[in-house]
């Protein structure tokens, strides 16, 4: 050390730590769940630990079942109240089918456009919560490739509830939705035995999400 | 058939615990919610909560900060704990299962089936 | 929470006449998981008609539900000597579940 070497009080530079999320969550909301304001719920509870706004984090929310519904887009609502507002009033829209790859192709190709509200440069992250194997699973390695090849993050729920309340067997499914999940699969796939068990997720779901804001 | 006995003192004091227990038989206690509900006596019905067979529970805010739910799968058992009780907890206590049945489509057919009722009073 | 508001609060009929009850909500009832229970004095309450429509398992098709979103009706074709009770119309569309204040049909 040079011997003119001297200590003196300075300033931490700033962290630099970027705070801009789009985040597109596609819910299931097709026959099968029950009680829909679990979801809600779940949603509340996640929804009221982002920071959203223009400038912060941005969330869409799409529903699916048998078709696809933009329930609101990313730049609809500039605040987490109004967001919060907005979610609370989600109804379930039912389908007796559960079309996962749909519900994700649609969020990839449409919820993620700057005509709904996307930003350049902004990281994407898709929330994907399902209660049952997908009825068009023969396009979902395809989906998921192209959600990779955009660089969406994917987190996704596999809710138990209908396959435990039917004694079915869940291995199919739990591989499916690990399926839909980004790498490492461990971080960011989840599973609950019911519907009133997702809001146990949402600290840990909410954590994970804002983990790759530092990234 | 489907039969939920349920089991409790009748009388509590003011500021304890109440604690009941209902049973299941002819169905399985994994394959659906069941919920307690009270009446008063001469009034209407108002619905305490829900658990399922994970433990996971739904409460009436109403009545959350008292509530407990637990259920003992090997005994086909789930049960109410209301602590802090007053006379306004006077009621009939019931327990019921909310229904369900996956036939080309899946139906939910609210509370379908029902104990027998408890009468509950609380006084010193 | 949904409040649910049944009338009239008492119906005074003769047995083979017909009943008409409702209940009104005071939002859109989910998917219209609305039902229909039956209880008599000193018993549980059985359920007749669950999503606003369908009768429960061997509950007599005198029975019939009807309405959608906030307007719910019970409509009792004859009555039947058995049939007077209490009537309490119940949401089970989100929580916390909600019942109605009761509709008592009593014999004129």
């Known amino acids: 050390v040079s011997p003119t070497f001297q200590v003196v009080n300075s300033i931490a530079p700033v962290q630099e730590c970027s705070t801009q999320l789009d985040i597109v969550i596609v819910l299931d909301g097709s026959n099968s769940i029950y009680p829909w304001d679990s979801v809600t719920a779940f949603l509340n509870d996640l929804l009221e630990r982002m920071d959203i706004g223009p400038k912060q984090t941005q969330v869409g929310i799409v529903q699916y079942g048998e078709n696809v519904t933009h329930e609101f887009n990313l730049n609809k609502y500039s605040s987490t109240e109004e967001v919060l507002v907005a979610a609370k009033k989600i109804v379930q829209r039912g389908g007796r089918q559960t079309m996962t790859a749909l519900g994700i192709d649609t969020a990839r190709k449409e919820a993620f456009t700057e005509a709904r509200g996307a930003r350049r440069g902004v990281k994407k992250v898709m929330v994907i919560v399902t209660d049952g194997e997908s009825h068009d699973n023969h396009r979902l390695k395809k989906v998921i490739q192209d959600c990779e090849d955009e660089n969406i993050q994917r987190f996704s729920i596999a809710i138990l509830g209908s396959y435990n309340r039917g004694n079915l067997s869940t291995e199919k499914f739990v591989e499916e939705i690990k399926s839909i999940a980004s790498e490492p699969t461990e971080k960011h796939f989840f599973n609950v035995s019911d519907e009133l068990a997702l809001v146990t997720i949402v600290k840990t779901l909410g954590e994970r999400i804002f983990a790759l804001e530092a990234t | 058939q489907v039969q939920l006995q349920q089991s409790g003192p009748g009388l509590v004091k003011p500021s304890e615990t109440l604690s009941l227990t209902c049973t299941v038989s002819g169905a399985s206690i994994s394959s659906y919610y069941w919920s307690w509900i009270r009446q008063p006596a001469g009034k209407g019905l108002e619905w305490i909560g829900r658990?399922?067979?994970?433990?996971?529970?739904n409460y009436n805010p109403s009545l959350k900060s008292r509530v407990t739910m637990s259920v003992d799968t090997s005994k086909s058992q789930f049960s109410l704990n209301l602590s802090s009780v007053t006379a306004a907890d006077t009621a009939v206590y019931y327990c019921?299962?909310?229904?369900?049945?996956?036939?080309?489509?899946?139906?939910?057919?609210?509370?379908?089936?029902w104990g027998q009722g408890t009468t509950v009073t609380v006084s010193s | 929470e949904i409040v649910l508001t049944q009338s009239p609060g008492t119906l005074s009929l003769s047995p083979g006449e017909r009943a008409t009850l409702s209940c009104r909500a005071s939002q859109s009832v989910s998917r219209n998981y609305l039902a229909w229970n039956q209880q008599k004095p000193g018993q549980a309450p059985r359920l007749l008609i669950y999503?606003?429509?369908s009768r429960a398992t061997g509950i007599p098709d005198r029975f019939s539900g009807s309405g959608s979103g906030t307007d719910f009706t019970l409509t009792i074709s004859r009555l039947e000597p058995e049939d007077f009770a209490v009537y309490y119309c119940q949401q089970y569309g989100s929580s916390p579940l909600t019942f109605g204040g009761g509709t008592k049909v009593e014999i004129k």
């Open positions: 658990i399922y067979a994970s433990g996971s529970t």
């Open positions: 019921a299962r909310e229904g369900w049945e996956r036939l080309q489509d899946y139906y939910y057919y609210g509370l379908d089936v």
């Open positions: 999503g606003a429509s």
